[in-house]
């Protein structure tokens, strides 16, 4: 914390300006007015304080505005907005998407720090819902923030959101987000021609249902293992091992190495030994030849 | 990477005259505004003086009259000429980009004027 001294002669803060970086810490704390930060807080992201000067500003409005600042202040912080702490923004009401999209900027390139997320945090409980607008800034600004939302939070995303999304942004969503933001992704990606089409809905597939696995398998698409590798098993366990085949291209002969785990696992228990040995990779573990396979949950529909 | 190299201190009686120099590589130089920085023992770090890409020069109350900024484009190299050196002069300085907004840090040059 600065000492109080008094400001020297002369020195006294008439305005917000260049001349302020000369000033050592003490005499910004003694010659600088709170109430004419305040007003003039847009200057202050232009003039090249260092961070040991941006912290006695900081002070200063701190003791202005001890409940929080207001929305005008929070608006200009500009560099100042990286030495508030999660607590300081908890006392803040941001209601302005400019105000927002100007403290997201500040934090561009830069992975999502607590203080963004407890801004963004704030900025949806103030502004009571998380609506298309809102969703839009966040995915341009953190792509990956997708995966952090509900998938009730999710189903209000626009599709025009998807083309943001960077596969790595998915990395951290789970099959039950996945299942909201493939359709999503389908709806974006629709007037894409076939081999375009696929690298882009490639990342979503963890959402994908059976019918769209065996129209992939019917265009070439070579998925490789990794992918296959999270796709649902339930949407999985229906194909047949020709439209595995297919789907997977040359990459099929990988089913080996993942013959243990799922989804190829419990895929494998699924086929005909018989319709397996075609692959000639020697997987294991099919249907015995000569055994009848009952659908019970088929049996049940019908009584 | 920016890299930022100061040379030129030294002990000196008052009233005499150094040159401090700072290479600078990794960046756009030219395009920059630069800074000279110094902390006295026991003090804070205060900004000195400053130069930006278009020329125009600024200086600390305490150095103006005396102290000279400059630079040379074609050597990614500004200047500090001190004249009329004061033992309140007596400080580590330190050049930096003004977009960096570190201030005092790293190595600098010591600067020691005896009365």
């Known amino acids: 914390e600065v000492e109080k001294t008094a400001c020297p002669s002369g020195k006294k803060a008439r305005e917000i300006d260049e001349s302020l970086i000369f000033y050592k810490k003490w005499e910004l704390e003694a010659c600088v007015d709170a109430a004419l930060l305040a007003t003039q807080m847009d200057r202050v992201n232009a003039i090249p304080f260092t961070y040991e000067q941006l912290d006695v500003l900081k002070h200063k409005l701190d003791e202005l505005y001890p409940q929080g600042y207001p929305e005008s202040v929070i608006q200009h912080l500009g560099y100042l907005f990286l030495k508030m702490s999660p607590e300081d923004i908890r006392k803040w009401n941001v209601t302005s998407l400019e105000t927002l999209k100007a403290l997201l900027e500040v934090n561009k390139g830069h992975e999502m720090s607590p203080q963004v997320a407890t801004l963004i945090d704030r900025f949806v409980k103030g502004r009571g819902q998380l609506d298309k607008d809102t969703l839009d800034t966040l995915t341009a600004f953190y792509p990956g923030y997708l995966c952090s939302l509900s998938p009730e939070e999710l189903s209000s995303v626009p599709p025009s959101s998807i083309w943001a999304v960077r596969p790595q942004d998915l990395d951290t969503c789970d099959p039950r987000q996945l299942d909201v933001l493939y359709p999503k992704a389908r709806l974006a990606f629709q007037n894409m021609n076939g081999s375009e089409y696929f690298v882009k809905i490639q990342s979503f597939l963890g959402g994908a249902p059976t019918e769209d696995l065996k129209a992939l398998s019917q265009q070439n698409v070579s998925m490789d293992l990794a992918t296959f590798m999270k796709l649902r098993t339930d949407a999985v366990l229906p194909l047949t091992v020709a439209e595995v085949q297919k789907l997977l291209g040359p990459h099929v002969e990988g089913l080996k190495a993942e013959e243990r785990h799922r989804p190829v696992r419990d895929w494998i228990l699924r086929q005909r030994q018989d319709d397996l040995d075609t692959l000639g990779l020697g997987l294991q573990g099919g249907i015995p030849n000569g055994y009848l396979v009952l659908d019970l949950s088929m049996q049940e529909a019908l009584s | 990477e920016v890299r930022l190299v100061e040379s030129g201190g030294g002990s000196v009686q008052a009233g005499e005259t150094l040159r401090l120099s700072c290479t600078a590589s990794?960046?756009?130089?030219?395009?920059?505004?630069m800074g000279w920085y110094r902390q006295a023992p026991g003090d804070e770090c205060e900004l000195v003086s400053t130069i930006s890409s278009d020329g125009s020069t600024n200086y600390a109350d305490s150095v103006k009259g005396r102290f000279t900024i400059s630079q040379d484009n074609a050597k990614n190299t500004v200047y500090l000429q001190m004249t009329s050196l004061k033992p309140e002069d007596t400080a580590i300085y330190s050049c930096?980009?003004?977009?960096?907004?570190?201030?005092?840090w790293g190595q600098g040059t010591l600067v020691t004027v005896s009365s």
């Open positions: 930096r980009t003004m977009a960096s907004r570190i201030g005092c």
């Open positions: 990794g960046f756009t130089f030219d395009d920059s505004d």
